[in-house]
């Protein structure tokens, strides 16, 4: 991969600070889940957002950490162990499993920086991979051979 | 949302440069799609990664931009218009549609920075939202009312 040159911000601009400020804006899914009028249930709706029309329906759970960038992440949580029948959208079909799709997302944690003599010099960013569940997917169960 | 203090890197450390270097490492899905021995097809496998066992199977397409962070993004591409039958794993079931799940991801583009008199001062980062398709999901078609 190419290596970018060092970023040279214009006068008075702290690029790291800009990154921090930009990244604190949460980015929910394009089609956000509306609050259910009924309790969350194992059924596939015929309207509404993708996560409620899916035959492997899921809800989103907010994961907020003020010491992390992004501060807000959303984790998918499956509402059914199996898939919902395409015939009715209501009962479960155990021929399919509802499985979480995971992704390792790059996040940054703030940690104290130390100067030459170990003095506290503000905060630095530490990059980590963070496992996020993106969605629930209806899959055929694995055949153990 | 809380506002973090300005990042104070230790001597000789350019935090923006660090962010750039860290972010150029692509982060594929946890369970990467192995190259198929057979041509990509509209069927749900009983083994292999999640995207090939799904009844809304998909492949990943690399989107590389050396002027963007992250440089490598992966887009899901559905292999079937409908869902695959849970009974056989090969026939399509028109009662379900295979739909892309989208997400607006924060990315950073490098652009030239300009000094006080408009002189070129290296590169700055510009934050943008970038639409990425994460997966294909089997859904019940919308009922038009």
């Amino acid at each position: 991969y190419s290596h970018w040159p060092s970023c040279c911000p214009s006068k008075g601009q702290d690029t790291s600070e800009e990154l921090l400020r930009w990244s604190t804006v949460p980015v929910p899914p394009l089609e956000p889940a509306r609050p259910n009028r009924h309790p969350e249930s194992c059924r596939a709706s015929e309207d509404g957002p993708l996560n409620s029309r899916a035959i492997s329906p899921w809800r989103y759970e907010l994961d907020r950490d003020l010491n992390r960038l992004p501060q807000d992440l959303y984790h998918a949580r499956c509402l059914c162990p199996h898939c919902v029948s395409l015939q009715t959208g209501s009962h479960m079909d155990p021929r399919g499993n509802s499985e979480l799709l995971y992704h390792n997302q790059t996040v940054f944690y703030r940690r104290p920086c130390h100067g030459e003599k170990g003095t506290h010099k503000g905060y630095c960013l530490e990059r980590r991979l963070y496992r996020v569940s993106l969605a629930c997917v209806c899959v055929r169960p694995r055949v153990m051979g | 949302y809380s506002h973090w203090p300005s990042c104070c890197p230790s001597k000789g450390q350019d935090t923006s440069e660090e962010l750039l270097r860290w972010s150029t490492v692509p982060v594929p899905p946890l369970e990467p799609a192995r190259p198929n021995r057979h041509p990509e097809s509209c069927r749900a496998s009983e083994d292999g990664p999640l995207n090939s066992r799904a009844i809304s199977p998909w492949r990943y397409e690399l989107d590389r931009d050396l002027n963007r962070l992250p440089q490598d993004l992966y887009h899901a591409r559905c292999l079937c218009p409908h869902c695959v039958s849970l009974q056989t794993g090969s026939h399509m079931d028109p009662r379900g549609n295979s739909e892309l799940l989208y997400h607006n991801q924060t990315v950073f583009y490098r652009r030239p920075c300009h000094g006080e008199k408009g002189t070129h001062k290296g590169y700055c980062l510009e934050r943008r939202l970038y639409r990425v398709s994460l997966a294909c999901v089997c859904v019940r078609p919308r009922v038009m009312g």
């Epitope: 015939q87 079909d93 | 090969s90 399509m92």
Partner: antibody, heavy 123, light 113 residues
Framework: QLQLQESGPGLVRPSETLSLTCSVS??????????WGWIRQPPGKGLEWIGN???????FYNPSLKGRVTISVDTSKNQFSLKLSSVTATDTAVYYC???????????????WGQGTLVTVSS | DIVMTQSPDSLVLSLGERATFNCKSS????????????LAWYQQKPGQPPKLLIY???TRESGVPDRFSGSGSGTDFSLTISSLQAEDVALYYC?????????FGQGTKVEIK
């Protein structure tokens, strides 16, 4: 053999709630091989499916009835019930209860049917 | 929703004649994974509830006389009475159970000349 019998008031006022019960005899409502349904037939017209219930309480309804329908089950009495709210004259019909087969994780045909009960919506 | 359309609306025939009526669905009710057509036929005599005659488009329910037969696949189906009897005077409905909501045709009325 299994029999179904509908019961409830024959006259309901507009805007009120229609309530009917279906009693199942010579068979258990707790069978895992069946769903239980309601179908109606306006005078001189065709059949319209209203909704279904499983003994565990899982329900699904005809979207055309716009959330006015509630079906419940009482396994101790071997009965299931229909409630249709905010009725109008267009809800006047013979209401049938029926058993619907359930096998290979799919629902199929209705058999048998109850005799039906005429419900008139009028003030 | 799947729309079921029956034709003709009524049929007036003599005893012993062959009666054929049709049912068309707005989309296929054939499941290619099991090669089954999710269609049933019912008979409704005056003042009585509907009675199941045929399921899976062509399988006769036990106790139904063999003069009744069903055929067709995909979107086009028919019910045939090979030799019309007086007790066959009734309304005949087709119904799909491929996808909820379950829907019925408007019915075909069979009468004797």
């Amino acid at each position: 053999q299994l029999q179904l019998q509908e019961s409830g008031p024959g006259l309901v006022r507009p805007s009120e709630t229609l309530s009917l019960t279906c009693s199942v005899s010579s068979g258990s409502i707790r069978s895992s091989n069946y769903y239980w349904g309601w179908i109606r037939q306006p005078p001189g017209k065709g059949l319209e499916w209203i909704g279904n219930i499983y003994y565990s309480g899982n329900t699904f309804y005809n979207p055309s009835l716009k959330g006015r329908v509630t079906i419940s089950v009482d396994t101790s009495k071997n009965q299931f019930s229909l409630k249709l709210s905010s009725v109008t004259a267009t809800d006047t019909a013979v209401y049938y209860c029926a058993r619907q087969g359930y096998s290979d994780y799919e629902l199929n045909w209705f058999d048998p049917w109850g005799q039906g009960t005429l419900v008139t919506v009028s003030s | 929703d799947i729309v079921m359309t029956q034709s003709p609306d009524s049929l007036v025939l003599s005893l012993g004649e062959r009666a054929t009526f049709n049912c068309k669905s707005s989309q296929s009710v054939l499941d290619s994974s099991n090669n089954k057509n999710y269609l049933a036929w019912y008979q409704q005599k005056p003042g009585q509830p509907p009675k199941l005659l045929i399921y899976w488009a062509s399988t006769r329910e036990s106790g139904v006389p063999d003069r009744f037969s069903g055929s067709g696949s995909g979107t086009d189906f028919s019910l045939t009475i090979s030799s019309l009897q007086a007790e066959d005077v009734a309304l005949y409905y087709c119904q799909q159970f491929y996808n909820s909501p379950w829907t019925f045709g408007q019915g075909t009325k069979v009468e004797i000349k």
